[in-house]
Interface confidence: low
């Protein structure tokens, strides 16, 4: 009988260590709510609504420094975890895809290809590269090709909307289509300087007999075939303080 | 029949090891998913479908490039050590928005930009930097801006009210609005010192024709662009007893 | 000096850290901006009688503790401060770190 | 430092890695593209005791621990990043770096 | 002090909609699920629709099509509307603070509405 | 669809006695404890007694427990009271927003 039931109790026992952690997980949640609010010097949560916080959270430089690198970091007392990493992902690269702009849409009545618009996030001085690829349609003959991008401005007095970013000049050979990249650093970094400054861009690609080859707007088939921006970005996590 | 229940509870035993194991796969699986969203900053898995993918990820070089060669790397880890900690939290940065006050409504009759209250247990002496952030408005031409933020004063037997913190001039050019900042350290580091004396301040940006562009009660979609004080302090925690 | 990781269903019953996560936006604290949840953890566990302890706190054993006689804690042997963006209710909002928030290693002692 | 290797099969008692893969297809996360799989694995086992400690917390333990005493712990002694590339739901595809989230050794601490 | 008020119409014809309005005092919607119940006479508790703190809305797979739950947090009201009414959904419809499976969800309910489907 | 099953459907005990209801799911509860406990009374609406599983809700007696994890989940009153005739009903959350009832098991009291 006696090792009967000292059986149960062992078996019960191994039970109510489950039971136990079950049983403790809110209230240690409710401990550590408690210990919070202490070590904050606060009696009590306060009070404060999301509609409230959407209205008092400055959109504001040190703020969003704040929040969007906002980073659980581990304190130089404590050499933090098994690694070498803070606990959030860092951003290497960015694939940026084009949206519709309202000032694209005005130039000349019909939405023209391309605005991209960007994360405040990203600072002009971690930029490392910048491409905006494009995609050529097949060529049926052997031809030269020149691709030409162009930034939006606002209009000058003589009428003028565009201004060069970039030209080149290339070679086709009949096949498939190709993608094409052209590097767009300076413009990126200016854009994120001058947010203001960003209206859009053309882009052309035009063959010897004038025909562009550029997808802009991709039609039946060239699903994936947008232009984008690839940009690559330094983030390098400082083993900071938590 | 001891042997026979010793050996059952070992069978048990090796069955509970293989179903705990199962059991647990899933909860697992479940707890990395939790954790990449929480890693990446997503509170929940973007929605998305993969017609969706089809069409927006580009088929081109770098998208090809980081798939195909795809890798997951492996850093070296570190490890961690003890914290020497106090109990309660420290403060590194206090952003401070403003409040109502009877004196700057008194002034003359209608509400006046801004007060700040703080609390006691910020010390002069630890005040690293205190910046006043304020939002001016955008602006339509190329403009001089005049800032002066003033500090009410109780009222001189010659009826002066308002005494000069800082004066700043800066150029604008049409496009978005602009924060600005002003070091305001000393008046700060006085007002903890004499708090009586923080009776609150007037902020004013006139532009060439006297229009206020600063945003000091902000109206309709002006939510976020209140002035606020950025006050980082230095609060080297004592190693305190508990 | 290390410590043991379990998960909730583990069937170790030896001292050992449990994940525990802290999500502020479960139950409506919508005054902590960041982080919204974090990884807290806990200790806990059995402890093999140590009759040198490094600490001479007292054991506190539970009146339903079936064997009745003290002996060494399962307790956090390591942590670490996080970094916290809030609303103090005083329309402020602070950036300070708060110290021993989160548990990284438990241990005997 | 090394660590046993183990399979789902195994009697080992003692502290191993096992091996976890976490398939994104097979739970519809379409929004990752690539990896579409990945080993994790996980550590799961039996500990020698240790008995000296560095904290001073008391662990109080819970009136239903049937036991109230504790010990070390089979866990991750060597982690490692994956890097992924994810669409991060505002149109943008990112390449970046996840920490913590292989599990490269097993070891008692 | 804190309380939930089911109120709307005690008799729906068939194929007509039924909404019920969910009135809360010393809660604030903008932090708070609120849960839909239902139990239909001599029968059990039967789980309608969530809508949460944030706004989503989770309904049960019975229901979906059929129901929709908002909330007019100014006005501190959860409305659950029901169309295509039939005999089957006479019940007591409860809300309740919270969801009742998740942590202290469910810790106070209304006193319920009975809703008779009949012609 | 999720399934929910408590039994005994009737359990009927004399004052003193202990009572264990039990309550299976189809599928495991989300973190193996998004599961609880209600009681009801007729004409009244349901009360909370557990939660996460086996934590007591706030003004609850002692007497009432919870145990269990995954699919198995189990409610305890040791010593049965008067009061404690009721209707218990297990409830169960699976993740994304999926939730579910028991048909419920009656306590009558002899």
């Known amino acids: 009988e006696n090792s009967e039931q000292k059986e149960n109790v062992e078996k019960e026992g191994l039970c109510n260590a489950c039971t136990w952690r079950q049983n403790t997980k809110s209230s240690r949640i409710e401990a550590i709510k408690i210990q919070i609010l202490s070590k904050l010097r606060l009696e009590t949560a306060p009070n404060i609504s999301k509609d409230a916080i959407r209205q008092l959270l400055p959109k504001a430089p040190p703020l969003r420094e704040l929040i969007d690198q906002y980073d659980v970091q581990r304190d130089d007392s404590s050499d933090g975890s098994l690694e070498d990493d803070d606990y959030h992902a860092t951003t290497e690269t960015i694939i940026t895809m084009p949206t519709e702009s309202d000032f694209l849409m005005q130039v000349d009545g019909k939405p023209k290809c391309c605005f991209f618009k960007f994360s405040s996030k990203i600072q002009y001085n971690k930029v490392v590269k910048a491409q905006l690829w494009i995609y050529l349609r097949p060529v049926e003959t052997p031809t030269t090709v020149f691709v030409q991008i162009l930034r939006l401005i606002k209009p000058m007095k003589d009428g003028t909307r565009y201004t060069g970013i970039r030209s080149l000049k290339l070679d086709m050979n009949p096949g498939t289509g190709i993608w094409q990249s052209i590097d767009v650093k300076t413009v990126l970094q200016n854009w994120l300087k001058q947010p203001e400054s960003n209206l859009g861009i053309e882009i052309k690609a035009l063959d010897e007999n004038g025909h562009d080859l550029a997808v802009t707007f991709p039609g039946p088939g060239e699903d994936g075939l947008n232009p984008f921006l690839e940009v690559k970005v330094t983030d390098t996590p400082k083993r900071s303080r938590r | 029949e001891n042997s026979e229940q010793k050996e059952n509870v070992e069978k048990e035993g090796l069955c509970n090891a293989c179903t705990w194991r199962q059991n647990t796969k899933s909860s697992r699986i479940e707890a990395i998913k939790i954790q990449i969203l929480s890693k990446l900053r997503l509170e929940t898995a973007p929605n998305i479908s993969k017609d969706a993918i089809r069409q927006l990820l580009p088929k081109a070089p770098p998208l090809r490039e980081l798939i195909d060669q795809y890798d997951v790397q492996r850093d070296d880890s570190s490890d961690g050590s003890l914290e020497d900690d106090d109990y309660h939290a420290t403060t590194e940065t206090i952003i401070t928005m403003p409040t109502e006050s009877d004196f700057l409504m008194q002034v003359d009759g209608k509400p006046k930009c801004c007060f700040f209250k703080f609390s006691s247990k910020i010390q002069y002496n630890k005040v690293v930097k205190a910046q006043l952030w304020i939002y001016l408005r955008p602006v339509e031409t190329p403009t001089t801006v005049f800032v002066q933020i003033l500090r009410l004063i109780k009222p001189m037997k010659d009826g002066t009210r308002y005494t000069g913190i800082r004066s700043l001039k800066l150029d604008m050019n049409p496009g978005t609005g602009i924060w600005q900042s002003i070091d305001v350290k000393t008046v700060l580091q006085n007002w903890l010192k004499q708090p009586e004396s923080n009776l609150g301040i007037e902020i004013k940006a006139l532009d060439e024709n006297g229009h206020d562009l600063a945003v000091t009660f902000p109206g309709p979609g002006e939510d976020g662009l209140n002035p606020f004080l950025e006050v980082k302090v230095t609060d080297t925690p004592k190693r305190s007893r508990r | 000096d290390f410590g043991l990781d379990c998960d909730e269903h583990s069937t170790e019953s030896r001292c050992c850290r449990y994940p525990l996560t802290v999500d502020f936006e479960a139950f409506g604290w919508d005054w902590i901006i960041a982080p919204k949840r974090y990884k807290a953890n806990y200790c806990s566990g059995e402890c093999e009688f140590v009759f040198l302890q490094k600490y001479p706190h007292t054991h506190l054993v539970h009146q339903a503790n079936p064997r009745g006689s003290a002996g060494p804690c399962c307790t956090p042997t390591k942590m670490s401060p996080i970094n916290m963006l809030y609303f103090n209710g005083k329309e402020q909002i602070i950036y300070g770190k708060i110290p021993a928030m989160v548990v990284d290693r438990c241990g005997c002692s | 430092d090394f660590g046993l290797d183990c399979d789902e099969h195994s009697t080992e008692s003692r502290c191993c890695r096992y091996p976890l893969t976490v398939d994104f297809e097979a739970f519809g996360w379409d929004w990752i593209i690539a990896p579409k799989r990945y080993k994790a694995n996980y550590c799961s086992g039996e500990c020698e005791f240790v008995f000296l400690q560095k904290y001073p917390h008391t662990h109080l333990v819970h009136q239903a621990n049937p036991r109230g005493s504790a010990g070390p712990c089979c866990t991750p002694t060597k982690m490692s990043p994956i890097n992924m590339l994810y669409f991060n739901g505002k149109e943008q595809i990112i390449y970046g770096k996840i920490p913590a989230m292989v599990v490269d050794r097993c070891g008692c601490s | 002090q804190v309380t939930l008020k089911e109120s709307g119409p005690v008799l729906v014809k068939p194929t007509e909609t039924l909404t019920l309005t969910c009135t809360v005092s010393?809660?604030?919607?903008?932090?708070?699920?609120i849960s839909w119940v239902r139990q239909a006479p001599g029968k059990g508790l039967e789980w309608v629709g969530i809508?949460?703190?944030?706004?989503?809305?989770y309904y049960a797979s019975w229901a979906k099509g059929r129901l929709t739950i908002s909330k007019d947090t100014s006005k501190n009201q959860v409305v659950l509307t029901m169309t295509n009414m039939d005999p089957v959904d006479t019940a007591t419809y409860y809300c309740?603070?919270?969801?009742?499976?998740?942590?202290?969800?469910?810790?106070?309910w209304g006193q319920g509405t009975l809703v008779t489907v009949s012609s | 669809d999720i399934v929910m099953t408590q039994s005994p459907a009737t359990l009927s005990l004399s004052p003193g006695e202990r009572a264990t209801l039990s309550c299976t799911s189809s599928q495991s509860v989300y973190h193996n404890n998004w599961l609880s406990w209600f009681q009801q009374k007729p004409g009244q609406p349901p009360k909370l007694l557990i939660y996460w599983a086996s934590t007591l809700a706030y003004g609850v007696p002692s007497r009432f427990s919870g145990s269990g994890s995954g699919t198995d989940f189990t409610l305890t009153i040791s010593s049965l009271q008067p009061e404690d005739a009721a209707t218990y009903y297990c409830?169960?959350?699976?993740?994304?927003?999926?939730?579910?009832f028991g048909q419920g098991t009656k306590v009558e009291i002899k």
């Open positions: 010393g809660i604030d919607l903008s932090h708070t699920d």
């Open positions: 409830a169960g959350g699976y993740g994304g927003g999926r939730y579910a």
């Open positions: 309740a603070r919270g969801v009742p499976a998740y942590s202290h969800g469910g810790d106070l």
């Open positions: 809508i949460s703190y944030a706004g989503s809305t």
